[in-house]
């Protein structure tokens, strides 16, 4: 299991910027416009535009409320007028440089509209949002805008019993079959488009990936066994001519594996996914947050998957098929029979075009019938290194974003920012042989779940934005200035931070104006380069004979042990003479002359099998009659 975060920052301890509007709740949709330096926030019955550099500065707002009549009709259907029968913004996607596509639950009558960014007013198009946005604010949803067309995963009906993955398009709308083998009570988590690589095979298609958890069809279990899935569709899909007419011909899904090898620890509930794209990366990497199905201990894991691994399952993997045994009992088994050509579920690529299949509408019925009956792959998608990047105890992770950053020595590190159901943000760096949890920051005053996380990693301006029920918080990617000494700065093992001997401060890397010459950073936590030992100040105390002295020592690191020394000998709490407050401050009872002298508080921290010791406080005590 990953260690505890090295540092814990309380809500008021660090520079966080907040945005919230009284009476407005459920800030669950965030969209960044990097070029405009604007963050768009979708909440219950409202959309806001705020300054991305300081989100407390509101630029625009627009309200989208439900009429009393609609509320009453919704309440008649057994829903709560005060909560459910409102308009929860669930889709907030860019449509053009001047408009956003916005959908809301609208009192169980999902509706979409265009938001003009110049006037910041809705155009009043009021399109039916069914299949694009859930009816119920409690139901899962995901969406991504691709070339002006909305791809979404949600439930299609009032009861929430009909799941759908669809493309909303004027010329070629597509949807999944309403059939259990295609989608079985899914909980949608994430969707994104992966553009064909410029140096990839000619005529390759863009693909849209959907991530969700659903009830297993392939494993018989005493309880509903949940399975995390990745599904993909092709952007160029136009449906079939007769079979799969207006349905996906390229819909395939596979199981995502996230488990600890040689242990019974299986993480099968997908919480969130982030696609890491970075200049130094050959291909995108999917980072996914999981929890186990029976999670009474609060376990969470992060697994990462390469695009190539995912693609290989869909393009070369075996299929599963539903077999009927004893008249009507269903068993899912590997399909070992002949696979039609073109390969079922494959995108129309140059090879297909060469065989005269220029569109999915030309595909032979055999291929279409096969993919209709075999949407599930037998092969599973395995994580990088066949193991989780991180397993954390006593925490329920909710969302993840990942930044790839360059350390002072030129090495690239993936830094994960993972939010919790109690309003905290964990920051963890992936090192060669371990994951180091740098810090934990309490983003929200109340311990409320983080609903959404967004990363803005524009050079010289990097922030994480978190949305919750009560508001949005903006946090910098690092709090370097909080590390008061060179040792602290290096021991943080934060790739964003380095010690500047010139100004005797821990500074943030990649600030455009900064020159990093002479800066000290060591991702192994080696503090030997920290030569400028800060001049040792001390606190002088005078105490009365027979009294009790409390000597303070402030130690931030959760990984360090506080050691008190007197006359160069270590003080133990076992002795009736001494006691510790919060494992940090020293109490000396029944003071006598022999207690006069120099007391040193040191922190001892194990880093890579080495103990790093640093002086935290020095107290000179004098006992008087």
């Amino acid at each position: 299991f990953a260690p505890v975060p090295r540092l814990t920052w309380e809500h008021g301890e660090v520079g966080l910027v907040q945005f919230h509007k009284p009476g407005i709740f459920n800030y669950s949709a965030l969209l960044m416009s990097e070029d405009k330096d604007t963050l768009y926030v979708g909440a219950r019955e409202a959309v806001f535009a705020v300054n991305a550099l300081n989100i407390s500065e509101k630029q625009h707002e627009v309200y989208w409320k439900v009429s009393e009549d609609k509320k009453s009709k919704c309440a008649e259907k057994g829903k709560s007028k005060q909560t459910e029968c409102l308009n929860y913004i669930r889709v907030l996607q860019p449509l053009s440089s001047t408009s956003l596509y916005v959908c809301g639950t609208n009192a169980f009558q999902p509706t979409c509209d265009h938001l003009n960014l110049t006037s910041f007013k809705f155009l009043g198009k009021s399109e039916d949002g069914k299949g694009r946005c859930p009816f119920d604010p409690a139901h899962s949803y995901t969406s991504v805008m691709v070339g002006g067309e909305l791809y979404s995963g949600t439930s299609y009906n009032f009861l929430g019993s009909e799941p759908i993955i669809s493309r909303n398009s004027s010329h070629s709308p597509l949807r999944t079959e309403y059939a259990i083998p295609w989608l079985n009570e899914p909980s949608f988590v994430f969707a994104d488009v992966i553009q064909k690589s410029p140096d990839g095979p000619e005529g390759e298609d863009d693909k849209v990936y959907f991530f969700f958890t659903e009830v297993s069809v392939e494993y018989e279990f005493v309880f509903k066994l949940m399975i995390p899935r990745v599904a993909r569709v092709c952007k160029g899909d136009q449906g079939g001519l007769r079979t799969l007419q207006k349905k996906w011909t390229s819909f395939l899904k596979a199981r995502l594996i996230c488990s600890k090898p040689d242990s019974g620890l299986v993480f099968n509930i997908l919480q969130d996914v982030f696609v890491l794209r970075a200049p130094g990366l050959k291909e995108p990497v999917f980072y996914a947050v999981f929890t186990p199905q029976l999670n009474n201990v609060g376990l969470s894991a992060v697994c990462a998957y390469t695009l190539a691994t995912v693609e290989a399952v869909f393009s070369r993997g075996k299929y599963m098929q539903s077999a009927t045994v004893e008249q009507s009992h269903t068993k899912w088994v590997r399909y070992n029979g002949p696979v039609p050509t073109p390969r079922p579920g494959a995108c129309i690529d140059s090879e297909a075009r060469a065989a005269n299949y220029t569109s999915s509408l030309n595909l032979p019925d055999k291929t279409l019938q096969f993919v209709k009956d075999h949407p599930l792959m037998d092969d599973s998608v395995t994580p990088i290194d066949n193991r989780p990047k991180l397993i954390k105890k006593d925490v329920n992770y909710t969302q993840i974003v990942v930044d790839r950053t360059q350390a002072l020595d030129g090495t690239f590190y993936d830094v994960m920012f993972i939010s919790t159901d109690r309003g905290a943000l964990h920051k963890a760096v992936i090192l060669t042989k371990e994951v180091h949890v740098i810090e934990e920051t309490q983003l929200f005053r109340d311990s409320e779940p983080v609903l959404t996380l967004l990363l803005s990693s524009k050079k010289g301006r990097k922030f994480v934005y978190a949305g919750s029920n009560s508001g949005v918080v903006q946090a910098p990617l690092a709090f370097c200035e909080k590390h008061g000494s060179c040792e602290d700065c290096v021991l943080a093992r934060d790739p964003y931070c380095a010690w500047s001997p010139a100004i005797k401060a821990c500074v943030t890397l990649h600030q455009e104006e900064a020159s990093s010459r002479g800066w000290i950073q060591d991702m192994s936590g080696d503090t030997s380069s920290c030569l400028d030992k800060s001049k040792e100040s001390f606190n002088q105390h005078f105490f009365k004979h027979g009294g009790t002295a409390e000597l303070k020592c402030f130690q931030k690191s959760n990984l360090a042990r506080v050691v008190w020394k007197f006359q160069n000998g270590e003080l133990k709490a076992a002795s009736p003479k001494y006691g510790f407050v919060g494992r940090k401050h020293l109490l000396i009872f029944n003071l006598s002359d022999g207690d006069s002298g120099v007391y040193q508080c040191l922190s001892e921290e194990r880093v890579r099998n080495k103990t790093v010791s640093q002086l935290l406080a020095k107290h000179v005590l004098e006992v008087k009659m």
Partner: antibody, heavy 118, light 111 residues
Framework: QVQLVQSGAEVKKPGSSVKVSCKAS????????MHWVRQAPGQGLEWMGQ????????SYNQKFKGKATITVDKSTSTAYMELSSLRSEDTAVYYC???????????WGQGTTVTVSS | DIVMTQSPDSLAVSLGERATINCKAS??????????MNWYQQKPGQPPKLLIY???NLESGVPDRFSGSGSGTDFTLTISSLQAEDVAVYYC?????????FGQGTKLEIK
């Protein structure tokens, strides 16, 4: 061939309960949703609710919430509908029907007549 | 709920003649260009039988004298040449929005 066979007719007293069964054969039971539809004497058809056989997840027409409970037994490929607190207006023929890919009821059970009389 | 209204309530047509039954929905039953409208035939003492799905698709095994048309809110079931075995009650049904609703039925008889 694909078949849905329902249990026989029932005569029940007001206030009692009845459980109607629907046994599927000839297809993969877990691959299709099962729905229940009722037809009161001389009346039209009314959709009551549905169940996902793999999960046991049921959803109901608001009108029948609290009246009908739909369940499945995967091991016997059988769907059930229990009607509680029976009243004379619950007298009807109850049908189970398979919901096919194209969003229609393609196979129906023969129907079970439930008569509520004191 | 979507209300389905069939017309006429009953219809008498001569053998070999065309029979037309209409169904009007209180709101559109279309989604992305598909019409989720189905037609069923029910004979006395029997369960309903699917004839047409998605407004115009003929269920396999159903004679091609049956056809369906329409979109949005207005739909039609046509029997091009009435046969004696077509005497029954015909129901339209929408599956675009729950609760799924049926028309009140049209009784077709021979004149």
């Amino acid at each position: 061939q694909v078949q849905l066979v329902q249990s026989g007719a029932e005569v029940k007293k007001p206030g009692s309960s009845v459980k109607v069964s629907c046994k599927a054969s000839g297809y993969s039971f877990s691959d299709y949703y099962m729905h229940w539809v009722r037809q009161a004497p001389g009346q039209g058809l009314e959709w009551m609710g549905q169940i996902n056989p793999t999960t046991g997840g049921a959803s109901y027409n608001q009108k029948f919430k609290g009246k009908a409970t739909i369940t499945v037994d995967k091991s016997t490929s059988t769907a059930y509908m229990e009607l509680s607190s029976l009243r004379s207006e619950d007298t009807a023929v109850y049908y189970c029907a398979r919901y096919y890919y194209g969003r229609h009821f393609d196979v129906w059970g023969q129907g079970t007549t439930v008569t509520v009389s004191s | 709920d979507i209300v389905m209204t069939q017309s006429p309530d009953s219809l008498a047509v001569s053998l070999g003649e065309r029979a037309t039954i209409n169904c009007k929905a209180s709101q559109s039953v279309d989604y992305d260009g598909d019409s989720y409208m189905n037609w069923y035939q029910q004979k006395p003492g029997q369960p309903p039988k699917l004839l047409i799905y998605a407004a115009s698709n003929l269920e396999s095994g159903v004679p091609d004298r049956f056809s369906g048309s329409g979109s949005g809110t207005d739909f039609t079931l046509t029997i091009s040449s009435l046969q004696a075995e077509d005497v029954a009650v015909y129901y339209c049904q929408q599956s675009n929005e729950d609760p799924y609703t049926f028309g009140q039925g049209t009784k077709l008889e021979i004149k």
